[in-house]
Amino acid sequence: LVITPPGPELILNVSSTFVLTCSGSAPVVWERMSQELPQEMAKAQDNTFSSVLTLTNLTGLDTGEYFCTYNDSRGLEPDERKRLYIFVPDPTVGFLPNDAEELFIFLTEITEITIPCRVTDPQLVVTLHEKKGDIALPVPYDHQRGFSGIFEDRSYICKTTIGDREVDSDAYYVYRLQVSSINVSVNAVQTVVRQGENITLMCIVIGNEVVNFEWMYPRKESGRLVEPVTDFLLDMPYHIRSILHIPSAELEDSGTYTCNVTESVNDHQDEKAINITVVESGYVRLLGEVGALQFAELHRSRTLQVVFEAYPPPTVLWFKDNRTLGDSSAGEIALSTRNVSETRYVSELTLVRVKVAEAGHYTMRAFHEDAEVQLSFQLQINVPVRVLELSESHPDSGEQTVRCRGRGMPQPNIIWSACRDLKRCPRELPPMLLGNSSEEESQLETNVTYWEEEQEFEVVSTLRLQHVDRPLSVRCTLRNAVGQDMQEVIVVPHSLPFKEQKLISEEDLGGEQKLISEEDLHHHHHH
């Protein structure tokens, strides 16, 4: 190969045009950074081949290595590739740009490396420094390559002066990787297989080039050897993998599989083990218990969760009152089954903003060709209690009655209480409970109805008061598992005129006389 002009180093002017010619006994090509350049190729009558590279409007970024090589360079000797280095001194370009691979320099041993900071002008003085350091380091510099030497794990920058300005290069990070220790990892495609299926295990070593693998496994103990396969993971430097493959597993292949790795240079070793289970046939097993009766609160969201183990992966279906459920487009129901480990699953039914109609009989069924399991429960929708009505009346019999009506699910309990001393109750005196004593002063009658369509209970309770001799605050409190509600009414003696405003003495109300209207007396509603 002949290059014209011959080089090996050329200094060209910025903005100029320059022609390079390469000729040889076979087709030749110009390359830069492993890329072919636009060029004109020709064949002369004397069977010599040439390629002409025209560099136009040169800038500092054209500084670098140019190679001429035979077009089909496989199997060529090193001297059948010619290198030319071109400088284009350009004051607008400081250091030539580097890609990330050049900025981060990883080492596996103590060896000479090059910090590739290059300038466009071979006359410039370049110095090497620790990043943010002023002292120049005594390391030799080659304008075509950079600083070469043995470097500690630090970050470095190069400096030069162009005209009257100091220019810094990017920082270069030198990082030494530890490769002496062996770290083995073992994993299996599956740790549970059915008999007749394959067992495949992989043992991986990172960061060591020369290692020996040894496998221990149940078959080996009975003298039936399996030949492992070793390969290199191409996209990962020095990741070496040994694969142990046992086709058509038998029940006796259950047990511990151990990969032992040794490297001969430093005589290090490591081993890791994994357990494999071979089952006769697939299985589905429920884990934990789900009560036969589940609850959800009206208008709240509720997630019902079933945990089970299965192999192979099952199909999971949910039913309500024997009809198949699916994710609803309105977002009222969401179904999901997650694989939380190799053989463990969590299936969830989420009811969003629960409605009364969603009460019913639910079933989850998980199955595959070998086994199935199902789990059922009744879902009850709990509705917080509401007092719907609290009214007072005085029938002709002379007694006074207070009627309280409310609803909720589960069935509400009703508690009647009264306050005689309006001044001090309920802050200072606890209200007295009514209706649960044998005294003749008050009688209680309670009826409970279950409304099928609304799926809730209605409680109607009537409190009969025999003789009321002073204003009495009567409270009806309804309670169930998900809430409570209460209302109060003030019952006044018969002797006070009712249809007009009532004058209650200051003794009753504490501190002052006060006119209380019928509305005041009858509507004290608490939640």
Epitope: L103, F104, D170, M236
Partner: antibody
Framework: EVQLVESGGGLVQPGGSLRLSCGAS????????MTWVRQAPGKGLEWVGN????????YSVDSVKGRFTISRDNAKNSLYLQMNRVRAEDTAVYYC????????????????????WGLGTTVTVSS | DIQMTQSPSTLSASVGDRVIITCRAS??????LAWYQQQPGKAPKLLIY???SLESGVPSRFSGSGSGTEFTLTIGSLQPDDFATYYC?????????FGQGTKVDIK
């Protein structure tokens, strides 16, 4: 001198959009991952997102996913944060920084920190 | 998601004191941790990366240690410039997470 300068901050109404820019100088911009970090008034630092050298990999915090987009123009040495559908909680000083992420070594990755930061630009979301 | 918790939230100290700030990760993060210093009204500044590597130009009174879930930043002898807020930061290949910060103020 290695420098990052943010711009484009200002007052924006909730639901509105804003585009922040970060101009880089003094280093080979195209060789580095870049990151946006924000700091709400009186609060700590929060990573917003980052972008690799050629823009083919982008990652962001969940709270801005689908609303903010990070991009870069290596020819202009510029990093961008397009903020759409902004919320009051996006009010903060936004910093851009250089993220030192070396090429992966096998399945190992290394990280040398955010070593260069801009002075920040203030975004106020208010009606 | 991994949570980073710093303690204490505030620390009062005097010039010359030895100061230790702790950062805990909610799960094992190996040594994927950096420390930053932020002075009022300024941008953060990288101090430590990979849990214990000192960034160039950072005074040697700063040091980092720890791995797994527990990390510490130690300031050997507190200087006037060191009154600031310090943040730990976890990184992985797709995200970064900062601790809530530790403010070091004058006692």
């Amino acid at each position: 001198e290695v420098q990052l300068v943010e711009s484009g901050g200002g007052l924006v109404q909730p639901g509105g959009s804003l585009r922040l820019s970060c101009g880089a100088s003094g280093f080979t911009f195209s060789s580095y991952w870049m990151t946006w970090v924000r700091q709400a008034p009186g609060k700590g630092l929060e990573w917003v997102g980052n972008i690799n050298q050629d823009g083919s990999e982008k990652y962001s915090v969940d709270s801005v996913k689908g609303r903010f987009t990070i991009s870069r123009d290596n020819a202009k040495n510029s990093l961008y944060l397009q903020m759409n559908r902004v919320r009051a909680e996006d009010t903060a000083v936004y910093y851009c920084s250089r993220d030192l992420v070396p090429p992966r070594q096998g399945d190992n990755y290394y990280y040398f920190g955010m070593d260069v930061w801009g002075l920040g630009t203030t975004v106020t979301v208010s009606s | 998601d991994i949570q980073m918790t710093q303690s204490p939230s505030t620390l009062s100290a005097s010039v010359g004191d030895r100061v230790i700030i702790t950062c805990r990760a909610s799960q094992n993060i190996n040594n994927w941790l950096a420390w930053y210093q932020q002075q009022p009204g300024k941008a953060p500044k990288l101090l430590i990366y990979e849990a214990s590597s000192l960034e160039s130009g950072v005074p040697s009174r700063f040091s980092g240690s720890g791995s797994g879930t527990e990390f510490t930043l130690t300031i050997g002898s507190l200087q006037p410039d060191d009154f600031a807020t310090y943040y730990c930061q976890h990184y992985n290949s797709y995200s970064r997470t900062f601790g809530q910060g530790t403010k070091v103020d004058i006692k």
